[in-house]
């Protein structure tokens, strides 16, 4: 008796596809060993057709795949475009050779069955309509025309030309003729359901001279498209329901026993479980729309259905499309915290993951908004200028090659609380959803800048100091000049003593920035921050106004000009490591979208994609003469 289990018999028809699931015992070895699908020959040898090691035989090329689901202890073999040649005996199994643990599967592929020649077959999907053509001889033109549905004993009237209609077809069936053609009548049945499937007879006239035609109406539930997605990645359900429902409300629901629970619809309904990680996007006037879900969880796996109806709810007899979503827990997307906490006036540094193989992809950050169908306007990007309302407090730091970019938001208010997405225009799986929670501050911030009302005088020397607690001693301190293209880190010079010290004097821990001499271009926002390598920590911001010696005018107009600044670190050395990294965001990654999708993610995505420097690399400021870098003590 084999511990592997699956279907002993699989039968299908030519042109169709099969999805064969094989179950294996729950052991670590089984989860990681090779999985295979082989065909048994007359000699008893089993020839591999596909395996989890990446092998794919020539006869399966382009039409088969094998996916392992270690968390379910199953693997699935999908085979498409079946032919009668695929009929045979197979094994699904585990092991380095095809003589390991296995299970016998018999696959039979038959021809599409043929009906008697006088039967016309109509194959339609649920919710669609059918127009049945019923030809007749001229002598039956004045006679009654009818369509009836065959039951066991009789043929039950559907509709006739005297306007009799079966109650279950009222409002759905129409009998009509086209133009002056007196040799054919038509019956249209709309909003087809499973119950409409069967054999029909259309008839013109009575008795032996009557014209009759047999009709076989097949009403198909759409076969679910199989979607295999990684944990924490994203999925897009592309729903194409046709022009006839273009003006109806659209929905996506999830099958739950005998109901389909609506997850989102275009009337504003949304399941709270998907808050912050779902968008519904009407595509065009042809009834096409898409639903994007990010940050996939194990419990998101299931049977999904999209449809259209004025109620925004599933209704029998309306067109649908279905998917079976599998969520694979062996994910390439790193596990990160999905909730980031900050305090009013403070800052958060959010580490956004992206596919390390796509370091040159454009990075974005958008804020998910749930109103209407949900949208995610881009706030900042590597080539997208910061939105005006985030001036001076938002920047994106790209760290090419390490699979992470950082978004820093400071001067937090409770209004900043909500859901944000990390996006790239590359690998569509790497979209991350982060929930930002902002609590009222109950203590002084870790970083404080003095003076707080900073007005520098043109041509003079101006110094601002950033005070930090001892716990930040071993971290790198920096000042950067903010512009709407990023925050360019200013060249710094450590003036603090480097000898070991046992104590840490809280009052003397500071990093200073000196502008000497002050120029008009120096006006703008400056940030003081801490970081450890490429991991960014807290920041605080200050606006420095520049006024002329004689009159006190200062207008807010931050520019991208390089501050002629000298950053000095004045600190005592403490023998300690970082014990705390407050507000450091480690988000829960999700997937991402392609270039086309990114345009749908947010209203501003398109216009924000202006060119400009990424504003990311350390020490980006242009070189300046030494007179701008006098030491400050």
């Amino acid at each position: 008796k084999s511990p592997i289990f699956g279907p002993q018999e699989v039968s299908s028809i030519e042109g169709d596809s099969v999805s064969i699931t094989c179950y294996y015992p729950d052991t670590s070895v089984n989860r990681h060993t090779r999985k295979y699908w082989c065909r048994q020959g007359a000699s008893g040898m089993c020839t591999t057709l596909i395996s989890s090691n990446g092998y794919l035989s020539k006869e399966y090329s382009g039409r088969a795949n094998l996916i392992n689901f270690p968390e379910n202890n199953t693997f699935v073999i999908n085979i498409e475009q079946l032919t009668q040649d695929d009929t045979g005996s197979y094994k699904c199994g585990l092991g380095t050779s095809n003589r390991g643990l296995s299970f016998d599967v018999s696959l039979e592929v038959s021809q599409v069955p043929e009906l008697p020649s006088d039967t016309h077959v109509y194959t339609k999907d649920i919710g669609r309509n059918v127009t049945i053509e019923c030809p007749f001889k001229r002598e039956n033109a004045p006679s009654k025309k009818s369509l009836c549905k065959k039951t066991n004993q009789s043929c039950e009237l559907v509709i006739d030309s005297t306007e009799k209609v079966n109650p279950s077809y009222i409002g759905r069936a129409k009998l009509f003729m086209k133009g002056t053609d007196l040799t054919v009548f038509y019956v249209n049945i709309s909003h087809l359901t499973h119950n409409d499937a069967g054999l029909y007879i259309c008839q013109a006239g009575e008795g032996p001279s009557a014209d009759k035609k047999n009709v076989d109406l097949q009403v198909l539930a759409p076969e679910p498209e199989l979607l295999y997605k990684d944990l924490r990645s994203s999925v897009t359900f592309e729903c194409d329901l046709g022009r006839e429902v273009a003006n109806e409300a659209k929905y996506l629901c999830r099958m739950n026993k005998e109901t389909c629970d609506v997850i989102i619809n275009t009337l504003g309904k949304r399941d709270p479980d998907f808050e912050g990680r779902i968008l519904i996007t009407p595509k065009d006037d042809n009834g096409r729309f898409s639903v994007l879900i990010t940050g996939l969880r194990k419990e998101d796996a299931g049977h999904y259905q999209c449809g259209a109806h004025s109620s925004g709810l599933p209704q029998e007899g309306w067109p649908i499309q279905t998917w079976q979503l599998f969520v694979n827990e062996e994910s390439t997307i790193p596990n990160r915290r999905s909730v980031v906490k900050g305090v009013t006036g403070g800052s958060v540094a959010i580490a956004c993951p992206y596919n390390p193989k796509e370091s040159s992809s454009l990075k974005y950050w958008c804020r998910w908004e749930g109103d209407g169908n949900g949208h995610c306007p881009v706030l900042v990007g590597t080539q997208a200028q910061v939105q005006e309302e985030y001036e001076g407090r938002l920047a994106l730091f790209d760290q090419p090659g390490n699979g992470t970019y950082t978004v820093i938001l400071n001067q937090l208010t409770t209004e900043d609380a909500g859901f944000y997405w990390c996006l790239t225009n590359g690998d569509s799986r790497w979209r991350t959803t982060i929930e930002l929670q902002v609590a009222e501050a109950t203590r002084e911030p870790n970083l404080e800048v003095t003076p707080q009302n900073a007005t520098a005088v043109l041509g003079e020397t101006f110094t601002v100091s950033c005070h930090y607690p001892c716990k930040f001693y071993s971290q790198e301190k920096y000042w950067c000049k903010w512009s709407n293209k990023g925050c360019h880190i200013l060249p710094s010079h450590d003036e603090g003593a480097r000898q070991s010290s046992v104590s840490c004097d809280q009052s003397s821990q500071l990093v200073s920035m000196t502008l000497n001499p002050v120029s008009k271009e120096d006006e703008g926002w400056y940030w003081c921050g801490v970081k450890q390598g490429q991991t960014y920590g807290e920041t605080t911001a200050i606006y420095i106004a520049v006024e002329e010696r004689t009159r006190g005018s200062s207008h807010v107009n931050p520019t991208d000009a390089n501050a002629r600044a000298k950053v000095a670190l004045e600190e005592e050395v403490v023998d300690s490591s970082i014990s705390e990294k407050e507000n450091k965001a480690i988000p829960n990654p999700g997937p991402f979208a392609n270039e086309r999708e990114i345009q749908n993610v947010g209203d501003q995505a398109q216009e924000n994609r202006a060119s400009g420097d990424a504003g990311s690399a350390d020490g980006q400021s242009r070189s300046s003469s030494s007179k701008h870098h006098h030491h400050h003590h």
């Epitope: 299908s12 999805s19 699931t21 179950y23 499973h194 539930a221 005998e258």
Partner: nanobody, 126 residues
């Protein structure tokens, strides 16, 4: 609400045959799994066989103990499933339950079926 009604149970001699039928009423489905389970006196309920419809394909599953003797068949347009039991043995004596799952996915041997019939008794005498 879906109702499952089993029929065809009874007393049969060892080596004989019996055909069980199960009809589902209340809703039409085109993609689902229907299975047969059995429970012998004093024992736990166990999987016997299942049939799964998905798209144009049909998948049949059997427990090792009935392989080659029992055959499952069904008509998903009529929502019926039949179990042809040949070469019956005394150890096949049990109450046979029909079960239906509205999704065609998941291990057919598991208990995660949405609906269960009342059961029909099969007694195999030696």
């Amino acid at each position: 609400q879906v109702q499952l009604v089993e029929s065809g149970g009874g007393l049969v001699q060892a080596g004989g045959s019996l055909r069980l039928s199960c009809a589902a009423s209340g809703r039409a489905f085109s993609q689902y799994t229907m299975g047969w389970f059995r429970q012998a006196p004093g024992k736990e309920r166990e999987f016997v066989t299942a049939i799964r419809w998905s798209g144009g394909s049909i998948y049949k599953y059997y427990a090792d103990s009935v392989k080659g003797r029992f055959t499952i068949s069904g008509d998903n347009a009529r929502n019926t499933v039949d179990l042809q039991m040949n070469s019956l043995k005394p150890e096949d004596t049990a109450v046979y339950y029909c079960a239906a799952r509205m999704s065609p996915w998941g291990d057919p041997r598991g208990n995660e079926y949405d609906y269960w019939g009342q059961g029909t008794l099969v007694t195999v005498s030696s």
